[in-house]
Each structure stands twice: as structure tokens, then as C-alpha cells.
């Protein structure tokens, strides 16, 4: 039952992670303009991954997409490489996560399959909020980087005079969003590749019958070896030895007329 | 940088006509919003007409009908045709243009205001 919570829970967090993550990368407010030495600005510029907007002092908004690719930073290159390879992943996992949830049952599936799924899954999701984490860090560090450069070039003009005052940005709603989306995601992964240790069959043991022969002490249980998935903690698959006439589950066998041949 | 000349402001009888042109030069890489205010003497700058890139265009409801704010093609300049005239419509007529005048994938855009052409309507 925990497993199943752990699995089902791990699922809706990295899905409302993933929806983060897509919402975070189609949000144009990724950088926004630093109002702080003028907070009543008849204009207020910001930018996403794939336009830049203006919005003006009588409420009227015009986004422009970037139609250049090679006029683009290298870095704005990489965070959307980033945030897409996110969202493809997370999209998969998704998928996989669907098909490994416990309370679905398709077909004759096995648990060693459906624990593999959602290992694979967990993995994906993991590697998708990562994704989306890094995304996001590496535009909040270009963003603090150009911050400080700005705000090094208003000061130091010609003779040491203000210069026409430059535009400065800082982070922007979609940050915020993307970094608590990617989050979400890795928590979702790790929680679904706990889910999928759980899931593992646990390792049975299979009764046997012993067989006393005349003269020996020791019985041998044909079969009797342990089955494991891999999962348990008997990998070796060692033989059982008995000292005394017993089945599997202890009971104590008699002799009797049929044991001596 | 980016400057805004107007012309056309003149003395003018009631009901007649007038043509204010606004025309922007220097670094642009297009227009947000370009439109005119007015200031009356002892009152506050309030908007006129104003055109948006998407082709919208606004009017203060005291010259709406008499007004018309329309951009030459191709040019970065607007013209406000004003008809049938009145002695209120008298102020100093302002150009305002919020033009993105970056070059970088930024696009920053900035507000620029002209020097104002003087508009007045004898009755």
C-alpha cells in the first residue's frame, strides 16, 4: 500500500514538475526590466525565450519574436537546448510512468516489468528537473552577470559623467517558476525510484518434499533452490542442506515403510 | 538615439483645419505606440490620439469624430488631421513614441517625447 502511495505520489509530482517546466519555458518573463531606481516607468520591457515584450503606460503590450538565430547569445542557445530536452524527457517518463503505475493493470504485465518502468521513469524524471535547473541557473547567472556590467557602464562615462541611462534586468517570474518546477521533478523521480524498489517481487522459496536415503544424516532437497528476482538478498542462489527429515516449512516427517527402499 | 520633430501647430479659426506631423529619426528597429497629447495652459499632458504597432488606434473621447491619427507608409511618421476645431482644443501639442531603439536580441524599447508645437483656436 505505501508502495503504491510512494509510486502514485511520485507520478503526480513530477507531472505537475513537468507542467511547471513547460509553462516556465513558453513564459515570456524570464528577465524583466529593474525598476528600482525608477519604479513608475512609462515603459516596461522583458524577455522570454522567444520574444521580447513591451508593455506601455496606457496598458497596451507587443511581444516580438526572435527571428535571428545566430543574433542570439550562445547561452540563450543552451537554456532552451536545456529546458526542451527537460520537457521531451519528463514527457517520456510520463509515458513509461503510466503504463508502471501499480493501480493500472495492462494485461499479463509483471511486477519485475512494471518495477523496471518505473526505475527508467524515476531516472527520467530526474534527469528532467535537472534539466530545468540548469536551464534556469545558467540564464539567472548570464542575467546577474550583465546586471552587475550595466550598472558598471551608467557610472563610468565619458570624464566620468552619467551616461544615457541603460536598460538593466532582473529575474524575472519564469525563474521562479522553472526552479521550483525542476524541483518538483527530481523530487517525483527520487520518490518514484524508491516506489520501485517496493516493487520488486519478493524472493519465494519453493517447498520440497525430502527424501531420507539409508545410512545418511544428511537430507537433500531436490529444488531447493531459492528463486530471486534480483531485487532480494539471495543472489547466490545457494542449495539448502538439511541436518534432519523436514519439509520446507518445518514440519517434521516421519519415517515410514516407503522410506527405506 | 532616437528624435521626434513635429510641425504644423498654427493659429487657426474655429471649425477650420489642422495637420500635426510627428516624424521620428535616429536607431529605430520599430515602433510600439506613436501618438500626440495636448497641454492646456494651467493643466495636466492628457492623451490626444495614439497608434499602436498592431494598427489600433485610441482617441480621447473629446475629439473623437474630429480627429484622425494615421502613419505615413513605410515612414516613421504619424500625422493627426484635426477638423472642425474648437477653442478648447488650444495647448501645446506633444509627439510620444515608445520605439524599441536597441539593436540586440534584447529589442529595448524607450520613450521619447518631442518639443511640442503650439496649437491655437480663436473663436
Known amino acids: 500500500m505505501a508502495v503504491t502511495a510512494c509510486q502514485g505520489l511520485g507520478f503526480v509530482v513530477s507531472l505537475i514538475g513537468i507542467a511547471g517546466i513547460i509553462a516556465a519555458t513558453c513564459m515570456d518573463q524570464w528577465s524583466t526590466q529593474d525598476l528600482y531606481n525608477n519604479p513608475v516607468t512609462a515603459v516596461f520591457n522583458y524577455q522570454g525565450l522567444w520574444r521580447s515584450c513591451v508593455r506601455e503606460s496606457s496598458g497596451f503590450t507587443e511581444c516580438r519574436g526572435y527571428f535571428t538565430l545566430l543574433g542570439l547569445p550562445a547561452m540563450l542557445q543552451a537554456v532552451r537546448a536545456l529546458m526542451i530536452v527537460g520537457i521531451v524527457l519528463g514527457a517520456i517518463g510520463l509515458l513509461v510512468s503510466i503504463f508502471a503505475l501499480k493501480c493500472i493493470r495492462i494485461g499479463s504485465m509483471e511486477d519485475s516489468a512494471k518495477a523496471n518502468m518505473t526505475l527508467t521513469s524515476g531516472i527520467m524524471f530526474i534527469v528532467s528537473g535537472l534539466c530545468a535547473i540548469a536551464g534556469v541557473s545558467v540564464f539567472a547567472n548570464m542575467l546577474v552577470t550583465n546586471f552587475w556590467m550595466s550598472t558598471a557602464n551608467m557610472y563610468t562615462g565619458m570624464g566620468g559623467m552619467v551616461q544615457t541611462v541603460q536598460t538593466r534586468y532582473t529575474f524575472g517570474a519564469a525563474l521562479f517558476v522553472g526552479w521550483v518546477a525542476g524541483g518538483l521533478t527530481l523530487i517525483g523521480g527520487v520518490m518514484m525510484c524508491i516506489a520501485c524498489r517496493g516493487l520488486a517481487p519478493e524472493e519465494t522459496n519453493y517447498k520440497a518434499v525430502s527424501y531420507h536415503a539409508s545410512g545418511h544424516s544428511v537430507a537433500y532437497k531436490p529444488g531447493g533452490f531459492k528463486a530471486s528476482t534480483g531485487f532480494g538478498s539471495n543472489t547466490k542462489n545457494k542449495k539448502i542442506y538439511d541436518g534432519g527429515a523436514r519439509t520446507e516449512d518445518e514440519v517434521q516427517s516421519y519415517p515410514s515403510k516407503h522410506d527405506y527402499v | 538615439a532616437v528624435q521626434l520633430v513635429e510641425s504644423g501647430g498654427d493659429l487657426v479659426q474655429a471649425g477650420g483645419s489642422l495637420r500635426l506631423s510627428c516624424a521620428a529619426s535616429g536607431s529605430i528597429f520599430g515602433f510600439v505606440v506613436m501618438g500626440w497629447y495636448r497641454q492646456a495652459p494651467g493643466n495636466q499632458r492628457e492623451l490626444v490620439a495614439m497608434?499602436?504597432?498592431?494598427?489600433?488606434?485610441n482617441y480621447a473621447d473629446s475629439v473623437k469624430g474630429r480627429f484622425t491619427l494615421f502613419r505615413e507608409n513605410n515612414k516613421n511618421t504619424v500625422h493627426l488631421q484635426m477638423n472642425s476645431l474648437k477653442p478648447e482644443d488650444t495647448g501645446v501639442y506633444y509627439c510620444r513614441a515608445v520605439i524599441r531603439s536597441d539593436s540586440s536580441w534584447r529589442a529595448d524599447a524607450n520613450e521619447y517625447w518631442g518639443q511640442g508645437t503650439h496649437v491655437t483656436v480663436s473663436s
Open positions: 497608434l499602436t504597432s498592431s494598427g489600433t488606434t
